[in-house]
């Protein structure tokens, strides 16, 4: 029996479902009998979900584990993992038997979106060209860590004077604060750009500072 | 700075109500989950209630149909309302960041005793 | 009785490597992440390791945290006298839907 899986990870957005595709070719007269299935976690071997002995054993994993019953006699051998969370990433590994055994392993990739950046500004008024001020740039429940980029309003990157920090909630969802510091010059726009390195998705932010009334 | 500052802890009977509060200062309150845990008396810690920033609510089985948490963006302030109150809620109680509280207040103490 | 198994007591000398352990079940522990504090004779706790394995700003690297299946362990190495305290872990319980700590582990330096 040759077990086939997709190469590229599969990516799942958090509280989503995601699908871990296994497939096998079953020989004429194959019956759901003859089937040993077993999906376990590559590194620690930690049994998710199986299928033996006729029946579906259910899930080893937190409840959250399905097969796909009706398509099992046609060789479909996916895994699906239920309102996916941080601590599902990793490498899972689907063991076919029938009467010899392949395995193969699949990477499931966890992401979540960042919110739209919120930009503040200390001091927030009296501003004067050649004051030093702090623009802190935050965004939120992203996944996994996220990198962040300045610029300025002529889209030059500015990389000095930049702190980043990001903190994590109980479910592994971080929180970014990036902290700029810069000497005002008469007008200027300062972006800042939350970038999701596996979604490559981007969330922008940016004040504006003039003589008027500051624009985000 | 990042500060908690949690009030309104007090003395009060078996069957009492009280409410506590906890004034968040130095991050931007409404973005963030928050809770509440307890340490009774030369106990450990345990988890009472938690609030997630879009306010979806959780509590320990413990405190379940008699304490309420809640929250006033608009105050930055996060509350925990206390009813029917037993001797064994009597503790320390503290506000913090998250569930995973990355930051805690000072606490503040209820006493439950006639 | 905590869901979260800890040993109540731990001991070790200055300079030595002492191990609290932390053990739960497949609801917490097994798929969640697992969080350490230290709490210091008459102060609030602190978190001390997140995410399992991650230390806050200003945690020395002698505190370190790890996870295989479902137990969790908090190692601290090079021990110092001013690490004389109480030391919890906590995750998050599926079957409960709610934060859980550890019964807490008290450590002394002899």
């Known amino acids: 029996v040759e077990v086939q899986v997709s190469e590229d990870p599969v990516v799942a957005l958090v509280d989503t479902d995601a699908t871990l595709r296994c497939s096998f070719s079953p020989e004429p007269g194959f019956s759901l009998a003859q089937l040993n299935l077993i999906w376990q976690l590559t590194d620690t071997k930690q049994l998710v979900h199986s299928f033996t002995e006729g029946r579906d054993q259910g899930s080893a994993y937190s409840n959250r584990t399905a097969l796909f019953p009706d398509l099992l006699v046609q060789g479909n051998a996916s895994l699906r993992l239920q309102r996916v969370r941080v601590t599902d990433e990793g490498s899972y590994t689907c063991f076919v038997s029938i009467q010899d055994f392949d395995s193969a392993a699949v990477s499931l990739q966890v992401a979540a979106p960042y919110s739209k950046p919120s930009m503040t500004l200390e001091p927030n008024k009296d501003l004067r060209p050649g004051n030093m001020v702090t623009i802190t740039c935050s965004s939120y429940q992203g996944y996994p860590e996220a990198e962040v980029f300045w610029k300025d309003g002529q889209g030059v990157p500015l990389t000095g004077n930049v702190t980043t920090s990001q903190m994590a909630n109980e479910r592994g969802l971080f929180d970014v604060h990036s902290v700029l510091r810069v000497v005002l010059g008469a007008n200027g726009t300062y972006s800042c750009l939350v970038r999701n390195p596996v979604l490559q998705q981007d969330a922008h932010g940016s004040v504006t500072i003039t003589g008027q009334p500051l624009t985000f | 700075e990042v500060q908690l500052l949690e009030s309104g802890g007090g003395l009060v009977q078996p069957g009492g109500s009280l409410r506590l509060s906890c004034a968040a200062s130095?991050?931007?309150?409404?973005?963030?989950?928050m809770s509440w845990v307890r340490q009774a008396p030369g106990k450990g810690l345990e988890w009472v209630a938690g609030?997630?920033?879009?306010?979806?609510?959780y509590y320990a089985d413990s405190v379940k149909g008699r304490f309420t948490i809640s929250r006033d963006n608009s105050k930055n302030t996060l509350y925990l309302q206390m009813n029917s109150l037993r001797a064994e809620d009597t503790a320390t109680y503290y506000c913090?960041?998250?569930?995973?509280?990355?930051?805690w207040g000072q606490g503040t103490t209820v006493t439950v005793s006639s | 009785q905590s869901v979260l198994t800890q040993p109540p007591s731990a001991s070790g000398t200055p300079g030595q490597r002492v191990t609290i352990s932390c053990s739960g079940s497949?609801?917490?522990?097994?798929?969640?992440?697992v969080h350490w504090y230290q709490q210091l004779p008459g102060t609030a706790p602190k978190l001390l390791i997140y995410?399992?394995?991650r230390r806050p700003s200003g945690v020395p690297d002698r505190f370190s945290g790890s996870k295989s299946g479902t137990s969790a362990s908090l190692a601290i190495s090079g021990l110092q006298s001013e690490d004389e305290a109480n030391y919890y872990c906590?995750?998050?319980?599926?079957?409960?839907?709610?934060?859980?700590f550890g019964g807490g582990t008290k450590l002394t330096v002899l």
């Open positions: 913090g960041r998250y569930f995973n509280m990355d930051v």
């Open positions: 130095g991050f931007s309150f409404s973005n963030y989950d």
């Open positions: 609030i997630r920033s879009g306010s979806r609510t």
């Open positions: 497949t609801f917490n522990i097994g798929t969640n992440l």
């Open positions: 995410l399992t394995d």
């Open positions: 906590a995750t998050w319980d599926d079957s409960l839907n709610s934060f859980l």
